[in-house]
């Protein structure tokens, strides 16, 4: 369930505008069990931010992280 009390995180909103790329150190995808697909970016301050995987900037950041 997307609302279960386990440690499977799910996102219910997406960040509206891009984060500075330099602030992001890693990312992960949320589970397919979640009601909304999401990419979670982790910042250098260990903050976790939900992003829409369909957005161009999100895909570009993922590609950049994969290459670094």
């Amino acid at each position: 369930s997307p609302y279960s009390s386990d440690t499977t995180p799910c996102c219910f909103a997406y960040i509206a505008r891009p984060l500075p790329r330099a602030h992001i150190k890693e990312y992960f995808y949320t589970s397919g069990k979640c009601s909304n697909p999401a990419v979670v970016f982790v910042t250098r301050k260990n903050r976790q931010v939900c992003a829409n995987p369909e957005k161009k900037w999100v895909r570009e950041y993922i590609n950049s992280l994969e290459m670094s």
Epitope: T8, F12, R47
Partner: nanobody, 124 residues
């Protein structure tokens, strides 16, 4: 075991007040922001408010600003949502939620733990 237990919901007339509580256990309180989401039948849960346990930073959704106040009692690992000037459109099930580590990007932060929810009904 992680637990978030809400209480304080109920039926109230428009213009009235309620105070919701969320008692947290089973995880390090300072590592999470605790927030409130609400859900009406057939719609997605929406983030209403959030407080960072570590520094007290808060977030309020626009429709509740000036009416709702979130606070924490770290000694009791409990978060409160004081809801004043309630409107019929505030009617929903209110859920307590835990998201790491603070409210900077709330509600665009992943939710790791949920409470069971408490019903708030505002009659006109």
């Amino acid at each position: 075991e992680v637990q978030l237990v809400e209480s304080g919901g109920g039926l109230v007339q428009a213009g009235g007040s309620l105070r919701l509580s969320c008692a947290a256990s089973g995880f390090t309180f300072d590592d999470y922001a605790i927030g409130w989401f609400r859900q009406v039948p057939g719609k997605e849960r929406k983030g209403v408010s959030c407080i960072s346990s570590s520094d007290g930073t808060t977030y309020y959704e626009d429709s509740v600003k000036g009416r709702f106040t979130i606070s924490s009692d770290n000694a009791k690992n409990t978060i409160y949502l004081q809801m004043n000037s309630l409107k019929p459109e505030d009617t929903a099930v209110y859920y307590c939620a835990a998201a790491p580590p603070d409210c900077t990007y709330y509600p665009a932060t992943p939710i790791y733990y949920w409470g069971q929810g408490t019903q708030v009904t505002v009659s006109s």
